[in-house]
């Protein structure tokens, strides 16, 4: 069967696997006048990859909670076994109702863009449910995300995450939208409003038309046994234990307080949805209780003194002192003033010596002057503040925090590769890939101190050499390496780096990338001597920009074959001349040859060779090239990518046959690289490139 | 102490329209439904329907759908109901009971209603 | 609607005897969410409105004495009086508050002798 070239280019000849997994085709060129022997097309098939997500694809997360993906959740695996590291997930869409975000990483930052199945396994991947303003009972929530690990196809995934009140959630033990308990002083009456009670989100389960006529039912299941509950002034008993939240919003529950002491006081209830006029509706309900706390009207509340944050180390513990947490207080006890965690930091936990391993959420002033209360950094290097409420027992609870700052246990200066600097400039600028600084995490404040200065250049922020500089200039390539002596293709120089106490040094590589365009092109034959000209190596444009010729040293090579000059003519006395340096203008002249050997000791062949050069110019520093090329055994069919000077002697003695096609000692035609007339990189133009011989 | 006074026995002719009183005191008004239930004669009790005094909303039992009206006035603490259309059948004793949740805790004295031509 | 069907229609039981009064529903009047059935009952002595005696099938109002008690869940419930007292003479009335129309069953009379 014929294609042509156009056919392929077009992409209309396809491969169709079936069979083994190694195989191919057989083909032949032709251009109509010439035709190419057989040549065979190898194809390799691989097996397919498939993905394959299992786990439930719903996360149940109480509200304003943070909840871990796990793999019962979300579990793809391959068909090949795949690493689960090299699983990755790509958040498509993210969640509306609250965030995504990694445990190790600062979780005020951006949203998490992607992750991989080895991350979830560790339970690294956190959902956060945002509490609304408006009261509700479940919402739902989606996860759009794409899996993907090359070579098989993506998989979409939608994750669903149900936040509900009706889930058991440790974290926050009521089921009612409000269950903040009551302040009352002692002898006196206080009112239970919504901002202390509130089952709106029990209503909120009701759809909205029809919510004015629906209420919640309390029941009173134990009464407080140091005052009383009334409702629009009538006291609840036994025989009438109820009342509505209509009338907890309109302001009508109130607890009197029958005096005699400050005990605790609170009642017990049950709250179910009731229908219109009390009819039963399928809703939620709950049994909870109340607490009421009795103050002392005499009590002076205490009063929290400045705090100042923690710094430690990652993977440490260290004790909270009063320098952390402290309050006034005259009138109370140390051990009287407690404290209660409202939301913890991702970067660690408070632990109470003597109180099991685990986090703590309750703790005494006592436990801190006794130095008992420690943080224990257990997550990554990022600074967390603790939200607390403090009471004495008699006093509303206040809010205070306490700020952490983890600090890196180690800081790594990442060097990815060496400054370049462009020869005709002298100067670049240094960026991300010469200077990152890394803990377990990236450190975008890092700072940075010349500890052993460039011998052959500066450092220069804003045209003025610097020792000292930030990675936040470096980023914004503010920071410049200038050469200032123009005898050195290289040089160095040493920084130490500071991130967040912990320091670390680094030398950073400077190179001068050469102005020079080099171009091998296709193998080169053995044996024979071809002419270095600018079409192989080219300083043309260092000229022009440094307004002299530039030169080149030759620093090692070739491993097979030399450099020579050559006779301008047949006419010039002596052979050719061992050259150690030349010019862009012998290039230009053409009296540059490379004599290319055969690798002793082995069978012919193809090999590969090369050239260092240093190349100079007037005002620049001095650069380190190198031209690389393939060799082969010469083919008299082959049409060669630059000019021959002389092909071998044993190509020579075939010169009376009609295929040879260079005559001894004449200089070839200068052969140029194959460009048919199909578009460049098209199947076709790979063949003609790489078959025909 | 929770009261619901009616108003007191009518005599109605058939085809006529009647409108009984229930007045609420010893409690917040506001805070319960109010139903209406009769009885005939010698009969069980029946079921009519309930008025929100808060927001004035009703809810009337299928049978009376039509002929039954609810109203209340908040500033009076009372709550009214009228029927229309009245047919002998009609004759019963009307109470207004009010409910907390939907169980009835407190009813008023019952208005004897009397449909005769 | 939920038809609401007592038995016996009547009954005569001695003085400090026993009384059982029986309440069938045409439906469950059982809220599987809360757990509570929605029914209560009510005495009736002539010339008087009804006075509630039990809700929710079997929580006593307040001021009920303790002879009277109520069980029974979803469809069929029971009012039983214990040692019966001379003003225990008069109809008693089973009721479901479960749904609207609220209705009541046809009613027991019960008579001390």
């Known amino acids: 069967r014929t294609r042509s070239g156009s056919q392929l280019d077009g992409g209309l000849v396809l491969f169709s696997h079936r069979g083994t997994l190694d195989g191919g085709f057989r083909f032949r060129l032709s251009d109509g006048e010439h035709t190419s022997p057989g040549h065979f097309f190898r194809v390799t098939a691989q097996k397919q990859v498939l993905l394959s997500l299992k786990g439930s694809q719903t996360l149940t997360v109480c509200p304003g909670s943070v909840q871990p993906l796990s793999s019962q959740t979300l579990r793809a695996s391959s068909s090949a076994g795949t690493d689960p590291q090299l699983l990755l997930y790509r958040v498509v869409r993210g969640p509306q109702l609250g965030r995504l975000f990694h445990a190790q990483q600062d979780s005020t930052g951006e949203a998490l863009v992607n992750f991989t199945q080895a991350e979830v396994y560790a339970g690294n991947i956190l959902y956060e449910h945002e509490m609304p303003p408006e009261p509700f009972w479940e919402a739902h929530d989606t996860l759009e995300l794409q899996l993907s690990s090359p070579p098989a196809r993506d998989v979409a995934a939608t994750l669903a995450v149900a936040v509900s009140f009706e889930a058991a959630c440790p974290q926050r033990p009521s089921h009612l939208w409000k269950n903040k308990g009551l302040w009352v002083p002692e002898g006196q009456r206080a009112r239970i409003t919504v901002a202390a009670l509130d089952a709106s989100n029990l209503l909120a389960s009701v759809p909205s038309p029809q919510r004015s006529e629906h209420d919640v039912l309390f029941q009173v299941t134990q009464f407080p046994s140091r005052g009383q509950l009334l409702v629009s002034e009538e006291p609840l008993h036994a025989g009438q234990p109820h009342f509505l939240q209509s009338q907890l919003a309109a302001g009508q529950l109130v607890y009197a307080h029958g005096g005699g002491g400050t005990q605790q006081d609170g009642f017990h209830f049950r709250a179910h949805l009731q229908g219109p006029a009390g009819a039963s509706v399928a809703g939620p309900q709950t049994s909870e209780a109340f607490a009421i706390t009795v103050r002392d009207v005499n009590e002076r509340p205490p009063q929290p003194q400045a705090s100042v944050p923690l710094r430690l180390t990652r993977g440490s513990r260290a004790p909270i002192s009063r320098a952390q947490l402290s309050v006034v207080d005259p009138d109370s006890a140390p051990g009287e003033i407690e404290y209660e965690v409202q939301r913890a930091p991702h970067n660690g936990f408070l632990s109470l010596v003597g109180g099991g391993l685990g986090p703590v959420t309750r703790f005494t002033q006592a436990d801190v002057d006794s130095g008992r209360l420690a943080f224990v950094a257990n997550g990554s290097s990022v600074a967390g503040i603790f939200q607390l409420s403090m009471s004495d027992g008699a006093s509303p609870p206040l809010p205070m925090s306490l700020a952490v700052d983890i600090l890196p246990s180690a800081i790594e200066v990442q060097l990815r590769a060496p400054l370049e600097v462009p020869q005709a400039l002298g100067r670049s600028s240094l960026s991300q890939q010469q200077l990152r600084v890394v803990s377990d995490r990236e450190e975008p404040e890092a700072a940075y101190r010349l500890i052993q200065g460039p011998q052959y250049g500066h450092l220069l922020v804003g045209g003025r050499p610097t020792s000292a500089f930030s990675q936040f200039q470096i980023d914004q390539g503010e920071v410049v390496f200038a050469f200032t002596n123009s005898s050195s293709s290289h040089d160095h120089f040493r920084v130490l780096a500071l991130a967040r106490g912990v320091n670390a040094s680094a030398v950073v590589n400077v190179t001068v990338r050469a102005l020079l365009h080099v171009w091998a092109g296709g193998p080169w034959p053995q044996g024979a001597t071809l002419r270095l000209d600018p079409t192989v190596l080219d300083a043309g444009e260092l000229a022009n920009r440094t307004d002299s010729v530039p030169r080149f040293r030759l620093l090692e090579g070739p491993r097979h074959g030399r450099v020579v000059r050559v006779p301008r003519a047949r006419t010039e006395p002596g052979g050719s001349q061992l050259v150690e340096q030349f010019t862009q203008q012998d290039l230009e002249d053409g009296r540059l040859g490379l004599e290319v050997g055969r690798p002793e000791g082995r069978a012919p062949g193809p090999a590969g060779d090369s050239l260092t050069l240093e190349l100079w110019a007037q005002g620049v520093p001095p650069a380190v090239a190198s031209l690389d090329f393939a060799t082969e055994p010469y083919n008299a069919a082959r049409p060669y990518s630059v000019a021959l000077l002389s092909v071998p002697e044993a190509a020579r003695t075939e010169a009376g046959k009609p295929e040879s096609s260079t005559p001894t000692g004449e200089p070839g035609p200068m052969a140029s690289s194959p460009e048919p007339a199909v578009a460049k990189g098209g199947f076709l133009s790979f063949l003609e490139a790489n078959m025909f011989s | 102490q929770v009261q619901l006074v009616q108003s007191g026995a009518e005599v109605k002719r058939p085809g006529a329209s009647m409108k009984v009183s229930c007045k609420a005191s010893?409690?917040?008004?506001?805070?319960?439904?109010i139903h209406w239930v009769r009885q005939a004669p010698g009969q069980g009790l029946e079921w009519m329907g309930w008025?929100?005094?808060?927001?004035?909303?009703?809810n009337y039992a299928q049978k009376f759908q039509g002929r039954v009206t609810m109203t209340r006035d908040t500033s009076t603490s009372t709550v009214y109901m009228e029927l229309s259309s009245l047919r002998s059948e009609d004759t019963a004793v009307y109470y207004c009971?009010?409910?907390?949740?939907?169980?009835?805790?407190?009813w008023g004295q019952g208005t004897l209603v009397t449909v005769s031509s | 609607d939920i038809v609401m069907t007592q038995s016996p229609d009547s009954l005569t039981v001695s003085l400090g005897e026993r009384a059982t009064i029986n309440c069938k529903s045409s439906?469950?009047?059982?809220?599987?969410?809360?757990?509570?059935?929605?029914l209560a009952w009510y005495q009736q002595k002539p010339g008087q409105p009804p006075k509630l005696l039990i809700y929710?099938?079997?929580t006593r109002e307040s001021g009920v004495p303790d002879r009277f008690s109520g069980s029974g869940s979803g469809t069929d419930f029971t009012l039983t009086i214990d040692s019966l007292q001379p003003e225990d003479s008069a109809t008693y009335y089973c009721?479901?508050?479960?749904?609207?129309?609220?209705?009541f069953g046809q009613g027991t009379r019960l008579e001390i002798k």
């Open positions: 009971a009010k409910s907390w949740v939907s169980w009835f805790a407190s």
């Open positions: 010893g409690y917040t008004f506001t805070n319960y439904y």
């Open positions: 008025i929100n005094p808060n927001s004035g909303a009703t």
């Open positions: 439906q469950s009047v059982l809220n599987s969410k809360n757990n509570r059935n929605y």
């Open positions: 929710w099938a079997s």
């Open positions: 009721q479901q508050h479960y749904s609207t129309p609220f209705t």
